[in-house]
Interface confidence: low
């Protein structure tokens, strides 16, 4: 689990944000039907109630809003827009609410929104402008500090033609709105790759969780400007080897701890640089647990125990002898 801040610790220091004008502001102590409210805890819970839309009469004091386990389907632009705005809302949890579309500007008009959890929603459509506002040609910084997008991949029959990785990446980089993001969780999304330049647009990241995906290589991913990165979770992917460029970038990050467990490391001649690096680095947590998956003769060997003599590559066979 991630080191997400406790919702109650969020402040409301962000500037006042303009928002949509509701006819009558809700009464301060009003609680929407099908919800539980605690003004003392600044918390509203509308959980497992099969809601199909966001309640319009949320109390203005709400700082922590749980809308989990519902049937929201679509979050339109301005889904949380009120006048006066929900200026205190800092933590919003929409996990497991059967969302399949998050439209542009869905989270506009929430000036203090620090933590957003959209996990466990099959997002067939995530607008490029979901986190960056609903203007077509203008973007501005989002107040988000923590964005949790674990297991948001839709089933295959609901996926758009374009790449899911690309759709998510576009939402993360649009308008450079997430420059202040400290925590990003993208676990369990079947990612085959991380689109180039995404991380370059997220320079404030402290915690990045890419675990339980299908990442095969990090060759085209640059971590260079993530100078604040403290935790990088790459467990349970399909990584075969980390190449010199990646190793150098990780080593150059001043505070980082990298988690690499449960990847199918290929222990052949291409692994030599990584093994050498592992033996000297303090960056990798639990490095003594890393073991080879291939080739068969190396299976379960501990990477730290390998030497260069162990890491050979089979000679290239003549075409007539090659097998698939």
């Amino acid at each position: 689990s991630s080191p997400t801040s406790s919702a109650s610790s969020f402040s409301s220091s962000a500037p006042f944000l303009a928002s949509a004008a509701s006819a009558q502001p809700p009464l301060p102590d009003q609680c929407p039907a099908l919800c539980e409210c605690s003004e003392a805890a600044r918390t509203v819970k509308c959980v497992n109630r099969n809601l199909t839309e966001v309640p319009t009469d949320l109390p203005l004091y709400v700082r922590n809003l749980f809308l989990t386990g519902n049937q929201l389907a679509v979050l339109p632009a301005g889904a949380f827009a009120r006048r006066p705005p929900l200026a205190e809302l800092a933590a919003l949890n929409l996990s497991g609410s059967r969302l399949d579309e998050v439209r542009a500007g869905a989270f506009e008009h929430l000036p203090s929104l620090r933590q957003l959890d959209l996990s466990h929603n099959p997002l067939a459509y995530l607008s490029p402008f979901a986190f960056s506002g609903s203007n077509a040609s203008i973007s501005a910084p989002s107040p988000l500090v923590e964005l949790i997008l674990n297991h948001i991949v839709p089933p295959d029959d609901k996926r758009q033609n374009r790449s899911f990785e690309g759709m998510v990446a576009a939402a993360l980089v649009a308008g450079r709105a997430l420059q202040g993001l400290h925590l990003l969780e993208l676990a369990s999304n079947h990612f085959l790759y991380l689109p180039r330049d995404v991380l370059a647009q997220l320079p404030s990241l402290r915690y990045l969780d890419l675990s339980n995906n299908s990442l095969v290589s990090l060759t085209y991913v640059s971590f260079r400007n993530l100078t604040h990165l403290e935790s990088l979770h790459l467990e349970d992917n399909a990584l075969k080897v980390l190449h010199n460029g990646t190793l150098a970038e990780l080593q150059g990050l001043p505070h980082v701890r990298v988690f690499l467990d449960n990847n199918p490391w290929v222990c052949d001649c291409h692994m030599a640089d990584m093994v050498t690096w592992l033996k000297q680095t303090e960056v990798v947590q639990g490095k003594d647990r890393l073991t080879c998956a291939f080739p068969e003769k190396m299976r379960n060997r501990v990477l730290l125990e390998l030497n260069s003599a162990d890491l050979d590559c089979d000679p290239i066979l003549p075409p007539s002898l090659q097998t698939s």
Epitope: P15, A18, A21, A77, A81, R83, R103, A104
Partner: antibody, heavy 117, light 108 residues
Framework: QVQLQQSRPELVKPGASVKMSCKAS????????ISWVKQRTGQGLEWIGE????????YYNEKFKGRATLTADKSSSTAYMQLSSLTSEDSAVYFC??????????WGQGTTLTVSS | QIVLTQSPAIMSASLGERVTLTCTAS???????LHWYQQKPGSSPKLWIY???NLASGVPARFSGSGSGTSYSLTISSMEAEDAATYYC?????????FGAGTKLELK
């Protein structure tokens, strides 16, 4: 490219109602807010209200509440504004505009309303 | 409501002259939500400067914007003929959204 095409000029009698349209193209209609703005001849700009077509949330300037009605038809990507109980003070150009917190970045060409007996 | 007062109401400037238009709010406005529009006769307004100081697409670099709190300004470093227009400031900070009455900038 983004376009907002507004309906033709209207000449109506005092006390009547009028409904004008704003047809959007070049973008996903439900993704963006549409606002309506009034401009009397030689005068400044006055915000009437805004509609979120995706959720049909509607917000009015108190001054126009009760006389202005904003609607949106997603199937035709068209926003509408109806004004009722018209007086000569309502004679103006009415613009629809798309945008949000960071300004209205696209505007229709305006619909001229003349209220005269 | 927030009242935006623009001054001067009408201003004449010569080619090449530096021009400053001001917009004063009756109460503090977050600078992210203070914008300027340019409008020419018979045309719709165009977003000109957004969030106090950001030039909208296609706006010449001779334009700039600044300000905070209740005091904002639009500056043209060197007046050109095509800059003659009416300029409106606009706040999207509190409902109702409001515009200034406009400054009509004429070529002397």
């Amino acid at each position: 490219q983004v376009q907002l095409q507004q309906s033709r000029p209207e000449l109506v009698k005092p006390g009547a109602s009028v409904k004008m349209s704003c047809k959007a193209s070049g973008y996903t209609f439900t993704d963006y807010v549409i606002s309506w703005v009034k401009q009397r001849t030689g005068q400044g700009l006055e915000w009437i209200g805004e509609i979120y077509p995706g959720s049909n949330s509607i917000y009015y300037n108190e001054k126009f509440k009760g006389r202005a009605t904003l609607t949106a038809d997603k199937s035709s990507s068209t926003a509408y504004m109806q004004l009722s109980s018209l007086t000569s003070e309502d004679s103006a150009v009415y613009f629809c505009a798309m945008g949000g917190n960071y300004g209205f970045d696209y505007w229709g060409q305006g619909t001229t309303l003349t209220v005269s007996s | 409501q927030i009242v935006l007062t623009q001054s001067p109401a009408i201003m004449s400037a010569s080619l090449g002259e530096r021009v400053t238009l001001t917009c004063t709010a009756s109460s503090s406005v977050n600078s992210n939500y203070l914008h300027w529009y340019q409008q020419k006769p018979g045309s719709s307004p165009k977003l000109w400067i957004y969030s106090t100081s950001n030039l909208a697409s296609g706006v010449p670099a001779r334009f700039s914007g600044s300000g905070s709190g209740t005091s904002y300004s639009l500056t043209i470093s060197s007046m050109e003929a095509e800059d003659a227009a009416t300029y409106y400031c606009h706040q999207y900070h509190r409902s109702p959204l409001t515009f200034g009455a406009g400054t009509k900038l004429e070529l002397k």
